[in-house]
């Protein structure tokens, strides 16, 4: 059942916990068949997704999948938030689920939740430790 529809493999509720000051690559895994679609990144501001212009992006091509990468060099505290990639393919716009970056400011890293806090506030545990799979290929 091989389809030639463009697919963007960002899962719902996907998250990354990252440190301000570090470099980071946010990947949008893209499947396409013949012509590579035009892909862009945007950052959510309420219900609007604001297109990220003048940001460093690149493609990484692999055998069965390609990655459209948004580069953070380095990560800044205000990079915190939700991002979405979109592909234009045969005049169709395909949007991914949003992926959320939780940026910890190194200056306030000492203020990060303690293990006891984590245990008593499980949503923090979820935020800091779950779904931050970042694929280095």
């Amino acid at each position: 059942k091989e389809s030639c529809d463009v697919q963007l493999y960002i899962k719902r509720q996907s998250e990354h916990s990252i440190l301000a000051g570090d470099p980071f690559e946010l990947e949008c895994p893209v499947k396409y068949c013949a012509n590579r679609p035009h892909v862009t990144w945007c950052k959510l501001n309420g219900t609007t997704c604001v297109k990220l212009e003048d940001r460093q992006t690149s493609w990484k091509e692999e055998k069965n999948i390609s990655f459209f990468i948004l580069h953070f060099e380095p990560v800044l505290p205000n990079d915190n938030g939700s991002y979405r990639c979109s592909a234009n393919f045969q005049s169709n716009l395909i949007e991914s689920h949003s992926t959320t970056l939780y940026v910890t400011d190194v200056k306030s890293a000492s203020e990060r939740p303690s293990k006891d806090e984590m245990a008593s506030r499980p949503w923090l545990l979820y935020r800091h430790h779950h779904h931050h799979h970042h694929h280095h290929h």
């Epitope: 059942k1 389809s3 529809d5 697919q7 963007l8 493999y9 899962k11 719902r12 509720q13 996907s14 895994p29 499947k31 069965n64 999948i65 979405r84 716009l93 395909i94 949007e95 991914s96 689920h97 949003s98 779904h131 799979h133 694929h135």
Partner: antibody, heavy 121, light 112 residues
Framework: QVTLKESGPTLVKPTQTLTLTCTFS??????????VSWIRQPPGKALEWLAH???????RFNPSLKSRLTITKDTSKNQVVLTMTNMDPVDTATYYC?????????????WGQGTLVTVSS | DVVMTQSPLSLPVTLGQPASISCKST???????????LNWFQQRPGQSPRSLIY???KLDSGVPDRFSGSGSGTDFTLKISRVEAEDVGVYYC?????????FGQGTKVEIK
């Protein structure tokens, strides 16, 4: 051709742990977009989604059962294992594994034949 | 959790006649990515569920075109244009927009 087959005990005692294995062929669980879910169906009742594992080992659980469930995958063996602790007679059901395809998100396009698990002392 | 309510729960039909099943959700199934993750499954007696329709109206492979799906938001419909004997069974709607993913309670289609 995608096929899935569930295996495990047909009878478990209350409080015991159930371990079910889904052995599949026709796809790889390391391929982007792929996933496997476990779904159950008590006799004569509706379907209930339990857990899902994605290609990158990310996992999702039904919150009503999350504390009792674990799901793991062995990509080399083409297997997904579900464990459910503290079994109770209300957990008597046919347990299915299903192949999660992707069109923007997961949807189930192939199902196993199911295995009936009875919980009784 | 999103509750999926199907109606009717039992649907006696005449061979060759159309049939329609409704599925309503307690929240909109339109996702922020613009897609609506609403699927339909058929479960024939003694068999596993089989995928019929995904994303509201896309027919899964091998599914006869007498089946069709429609709807948006919270109201969805599965239609069989001309019921055949092999269509007997229970039909379930399913939503994949909100976690946890949930099924309807099923509609039993039987021949009059």
């Amino acid at each position: 051709q995608v096929t899935l087959k569930e295996s495990g005990p047909t009878l478990v005692k209350p409080t015991q742990t159930l371990t079910l294995t889904c052995t599949f062929s026709g796809f790889s669980l390391s391929t982007f977009g792929m996933g496997v879910s476990w779904i159950r169906q008590p006799p004569g009742k509706a379907l209930e989604w339990l857990a899902h594992i994605y290609w990158d080992d990310d996992k999702r659980f039904n919150p009503s059962l999350k504390s009792r469930l674990t799901i793991t995958k062995d990509t080399s063996k083409n297997q997904v294992v579900l464990t459910m602790t503290n079994m109770d007679p209300v957990d008597t059901a046919t347990y299915y594994c299903a192949h999660g395809n992707w069109d923007g998100e997961t949807y189930f396009d192939y199902w196993g034949q199911g295995t009936l698990v009875t919980v009784s002392s | 959790d999103v509750v999926m309510t199907q109606s009717p729960l039992s649907l006696p039909v005449t061979l060759g006649q159309p049939a329609s099943i409704s599925c309503k959700s307690t929240q909109s199934l339109l996702d922020s990515d613009g897609k609506t993750y609403l699927n339909w499954f058929q479960q024939r007696p003694g068999q596993s569920p089989r995928s019929l329709i995904y994303l509201v109206s896309k027919l899964d492979s091998g599914v006869p075109d007498r089946f069709s799906g429609s709807g948006s938001g919270t109201d969805f419909t599965l239609k069989i244009s001309r019921v055949e004997a092999e269509d007997v069974g229970v039909y379930y709607c399913w939503q994949g927009t909100h976690f946890p993913w949930t099924f309807g309670q099923g509609t039993k289609v039987e021949i009059k």
